[in-house]
Each structure stands twice: as C-alpha cells, then as structure tokens.
C-alpha cells in the first residue's frame, strides 16, 4: 500500500529573467527513492538517479541546474517556461509518487499591472 505523500514548493509566480527553485519532498513512507524525474508537460527536464546522479536534458542544460537536494533550479526564466512541472518519485517497493507545481512567468508589463504581489 502506498502511504507516502508528496509536498511541493507550491505554485510560483515569477518575473521573466529571474530564477526559481522547484522542490518536492516525499514523506510518510519508508520506501527507498531510486530515481526522481522532473518533467514539464511531456518533456523530460532532468533525472536524479540514486546510483548514477544527475542527468540534465541537453535542451535545458543552459538554464537548468540540479539541486538543491532533489530539487531543480530554473534560471533566465522566459514566458514560455509557464506551465505545469512534475516531480516523479520512483520508489521501492511503493512505486511512483507524483507532485505538481504550476509556474507562471510574467512579462514585466504584466507583472507590474496593478502592483499585484511581491514577486520572488
């Protein structure tokens, strides 16, 4: 039975050009984490394998950095980075746990509109 739960950084709104950290944490299970995949829509961004370490997809190498921990740092954000990101924890013996984070990247003109919130 899968007893674990994934906690995420929560949804994030950021401004174009900035950087953010996406993180997930698996709790309430003694299952062993064998690999964590980070994906956006149907694209693989990065893999952190317990034995082999990190692999960043070539198309994201310039703007994606591993860590902290099992998290992922996205740099030089563009509006096109807006979307849903998935942390997929492969564990033994439980199986797969998935966390979801929505990242909203705003153009400066949109971000300033109404001076809505402080942006990280």
């Amino acid at each position: 039975m899968m007893t674990g739960t994934i906690e995420t950084t929560g949804n994030i709104s950021a401004e174009k050009g900035g950087s953010i950290i996406l993180q997930c944490h698996l709790s309430s299970t003694t299952a062993q984490v064998t690999q964590v995949n980070w994906e956006q829509q149907d694209q693989l961004l990065a893999i952190c394998n317990a034995d082999l370490g990190w692999h960043i997809s070539p198309s994201f190498k310039d703007r994606v950095a591993p860590g902290p921990g099992l998290g992922l740092t996205l740099q030089s954000l563009t509006v096109n980075d807006t979307g849903e990101y998935f942390c997929i924890y492969h564990t033994y013996p439980d199986g797969t746990y998935t966390g979801r984070i929505f990242l909203e990247v705003l153009e400066s003109s949109v971000a300033e509109h109404g001076a809505r919130f402080q942006i990280p």
Partner: antibody, heavy 117, light 112 residues
Framework: EVQLQQSGPELVKPGASMKISCKAS????????MNWVKQSHGKNLEWIGL????????SYNQKFKGKATLTVDKSSSTAYMELLSLTSEDSAVYYC??????????WGQGTTLTVSS | DVVVTQTPLSLPVSFGDQVSISCRSS???????????LSWYLHKPGQSPQLLIY???NRFSGVPDRFSGSGSGTDFTLKISTIKPEDLGMYYC?????????FGGGTKLEIK
C-alpha cells in the same frame, strides 16, 4: 476594459460532446492563463483546468481529465473547452476566468449546459 | 487535493452589521517563497463571481474598503465592516497555492 464573452446555453443529449467558447478582449490574450470552472446545483465551484495561450500549456484537475479538453485560437483571442461523453452529471454552469498570480480576476458570464434526452 | 473549509455555511445579517467569514485549509497555503495565493469572491444571483481580495489581504480594483482580508498559513478571514444590500450573495475563498486550485464550499450572506 477586460471582457470575456462566452457562448450561449446548450441543451445536448447524453453521450454527445460539445464545445464552449470564451472570447477575450481588452488585454493581451497570450500573457495570462485562462481557467475553466464548473458550478453545479447553483453552489459548488470546481476548477476544471487551465490553458496558457502563449505556449498552449495545460493543467487539469485529475477529476476532469478525459472529460474536458482545453484549446485556444490565438488569432481570435478565444479559449475553448470541449466536454466529452456527456451525462446528466455534466449539467452545470461553466465559467471561463482569467488568472494572474493564481487569483481569478475576470470571469465570463457563464454558459449553462443541460444534458437531457 | 487541499481541502478548503468555509464557515459558516449561512450568515443571516442586518444592513449595517459587521461580519466575518472563515476559511481554513488542510495544509499551509504559503509557498516556498512565503507567498500565499488565497483569494475571496462574491457571487451574486444571475451574475458571474467577482474577485474581492487576492493574496490574503489585497483589495481588487474597485472593491470598497469595507471589505478586508487577513490570515496566514491555514487560517484566513474575510471581514465586511458595514453590510450593504449589494453585498448579499455567496462568498467563496479559493486557494491557488497547490495544484489543483480548490474553492471553499461557500457562505451565503442573507438578510435576517
């Protein structure tokens, strides 16, 4: 002035599919996410999903995966929601709503869907 | 999914009253940057929902200052200082911090 104009009420038969439109005006359509919300029985509000017109990226409430499909036509600044394999449970008012920083600042007028044989 | 619980379900009022509506979430609504995406809406019969408060306590443009929001973590409150006829309707809170966004069950503000 920001406006979201939705298509009119629909009466459809069980098993059919239908598409609701939401035409946006008064702002840069591609710069904001568009959400869809279901209101059943005049009370409960449920988030169905969103689409970001700039890149077509979507996010769905798992409950509505396979039931709703979200698309946009950037040339006409229009968002669409197609509802599949309709049953009486899908009878509701559906709203489109623009969001900024995860609050829904402007809403369409709502589209009433009645599923009945 | 994050469960959002609103109380009370119904709130009978007289014009001029001050009222509070509570919204509680099953987990903290502060993201890792300390930003909380909690908003409040008023839904009047025959109209679309309208945004009142975003980011816990910020009034949306055109919203009168008799509406105020407060709270943190899992516990949030909407206060209306002097009820007017145009304030009657259903009030909803929405958490947008965690996927999927979830609404509270609503509070009906009605005349006694």
């Amino acid at each position: 002035e920001v406006q979201l104009q939705q298509s009119g009420p629909e009466l459809v038969k069980p098993g059919a599919s239908m598409k609701i439109s939401c035409k946006a005006s008064g702002y840069s359509f591609t710069g904001y996410t568009m959400n869809w919300v279901k209101q059943s029985h005049g009370k409960n509000l449920e988030w169905i999903g969103l689409i970001f017109p700039y890149n077509g990226g979507t996010s769905y409430n798992q409950k509505f995966k396979g039931k709703a499909t979200l698309t946009v036509d950037k040339s006409s600044s229009t968002a669409y929601m197609e509802l599949l394999s309709l049953t009486s449970e899908d009878s509701a008012v559906y709203y489109c709503a623009r969001s900024l920083r995860f609050s829904f600042d402007y809403w369409g007028q709502g589209t009433t869907l009645t599923v009945s044989s | 999914d994050v469960v959002v619980t609103q109380t009370p379900l119904s709130l009978p009022v007289s014009f001029g009253d001050q009222v509070s509506i509570s919204c509680r979430s099953s987990q903290s609504l502060a993201n890792s940057y300390g930003t909380t995406y909690l908003s409040w809406y008023l839904h009047k019969p025959g109209q679309s929902p309208q945004l009142l408060i975003y980011g816990i306590s910020n009034r949306f443009s055109g919203v009168p200052d008799r509406f105020s929001g407060s709270g943190s973590g899992t516990d949030f409150t909407l206060k209306i200082s002097t009820i007017k006829p145009e304030d009657l309707g259903m009030y909803y809170c929405l958490q947008g911090t965690h996927q999927p966004p979830t609404f509270g069950g609503g509070t009906k503000l009605e005349i006694k």
